[in-house]
């Protein structure tokens, strides 16, 4: 069954600033990433950044940096200042569509008491969806 | 349009160190992974390792830890590798590629001849 | 790392031939591999990604099959432009590694 990991980082240069790193444990090919905050992308959740393998990269405000990691990884720097910016409990998601598995997507947030800049390796997130 | 410049042949003596440059122009190095690639004449390629240059972070192959130094320089969009105590197995051709905006190396430089000998 | 094992490492053939290459992966890579072309004094290219994605531009007799550790790539029929050296590459998980390499020649 492919799974989905999320894991997000505070950078201890700038508190306010989150890494979001996701992966994708599948044997498909990766057709598009989407990843969200405020919940799963299409249930009150808002896009930050919609990763394409041909097509490439589109962003919104607060994300700064998206960027592709490996063919089944990804990284979404977001910037932490303004009125949009994240706070440490702010939920984080990642879909990834793939042929032929479908759509998976897994959510995660900061981890409670973590120093910044500090994480524990990426482990997979509950799967929420699989469309 | 998207290039990868590298810098020229480099003939030095063993011992020596080396520091070559790539170019980049029609993008921002900020939004990719720099990866340099090693290849030796009728050989395969290695992947020394990348760097983030939002961040200065590296990573290299086990191989190369102590050989090689990536480093980069946002504000002229130009990554560089270093090679130290540099040997006849150092002589090969250098590539500097990128990755990130698509999920393989889209984009390559020329590549660097690198020659060790005294 | 991950052990890219890439056959044959030449290929002598005639245009027209058919031609398969084949790599094989030490561990399980899903479908994170891509093959590249290097024609001879050039740097690489590009052909597929995710073991079988054409990359834009990339004539449709260039194809790619396989998942996990096993990966094929063949050449329907070849031309006599496709003279170079074709490498399978992994980057499932760091650090990035290549196969050997095979020289295809033409007759």
């Known amino acids: 069954t492919p799974e989905v990991w999320v894991q997000v980082r505070m950078e201890a240069t700038e508190l306010s600033s989150f890494t979001i790193r996701c992966g994708f444990l599948g044997s498909g090919s990766i057709s598009l990433v989407t990843v969200s905050w405020g919940g799963p992308n299409g249930a009150g959740g808002t896009t930050l950044a919609v990763l394409h393998p041909e097509r490439g990269i589109r962003q919104w405000a607060p994300a700064r940096q998206a960027r592709w990691e490996t063919q089944s990884s990804i990284s979404l720097i977001l910037e932490g200042s303004g009125a949009s910016s994240p706070c440490a409990n702010t939920t984080f998601c990642c879909k990834f569509a793939s042929f032929p598995e479908g759509s998976w997507e897994a959510c995660g947030s900061l981890p409670p008491s973590s120093d910044p800049g500090l994480s524990a390796p990426p482990t997979p997130a509950p799967i929420l969806r699989a469309d | 349009e998207v290039q990868l410049q590298q810098s020229g042949a480099e003939l030095v003596k063993p011992g020596a160190s080396v520091k070559l440059s790539c170019t980049a122009s029609g993008f921002n190095i900020k939004d990719i992974y720099m990866h340099w690639l090693k290849q030796r004449p009728e050989q395969g390629l290695e992947w020394i390792g990348r760097?983030?240059?939002?961040?200065?972070?590296?990573e290299y192959d086990p191989r190369f830890r102590g050989k090689a130094t990536l480093t980069a320089d946002t504000s002229s969009n130009i990554a560089y590798l270093q090679l130290s105590s540099l040997t006849s197995e150092d002589t090969a051709v250098y590539y500097c590629?990128?990755?990130?905006?698509?999920?393989?190396?889209?984009?390559w430089g020329q590549g660097t001849t690198l020659t060790v000998s005294s | 790392g991950i052990v890219m094992t890439q056959t044959p490492k030449f290929l002598l053939v005639s245009a027209g031939d058919r031609v398969t290459i084949t790599c094989k992966a030490s561990q399980s890579v899903n479908k994170a591999v891509v093959w590249y072309q290097q024609k001879p004094g050039q740097s690489p290219k590009l052909l597929i990604s995710?073991?079988?994605n054409r990359y834009t531009g990339v004539p449709d007799r260039f194809t790619g099959s396989g998942y996990g550790t096993d990966f094929t790539f063949s050449i329907s029929t070849v031309q006599a432009e496709d003279l170079a050296v074709y490498f399978c590459q992994q980057d499932y998980s760091s650090p990035w590694t290549f196969g050997g390499g095979t020289k295809l020649e033409i007759k």
């Open positions: 995710y073991a079988s």
């Open positions: 760097i983030d240059p939002t961040n200065g972070n590296s």
């Open positions: 590629a990128r990755f990130g905006i698509y999920p393989y190396f889209d984009y």
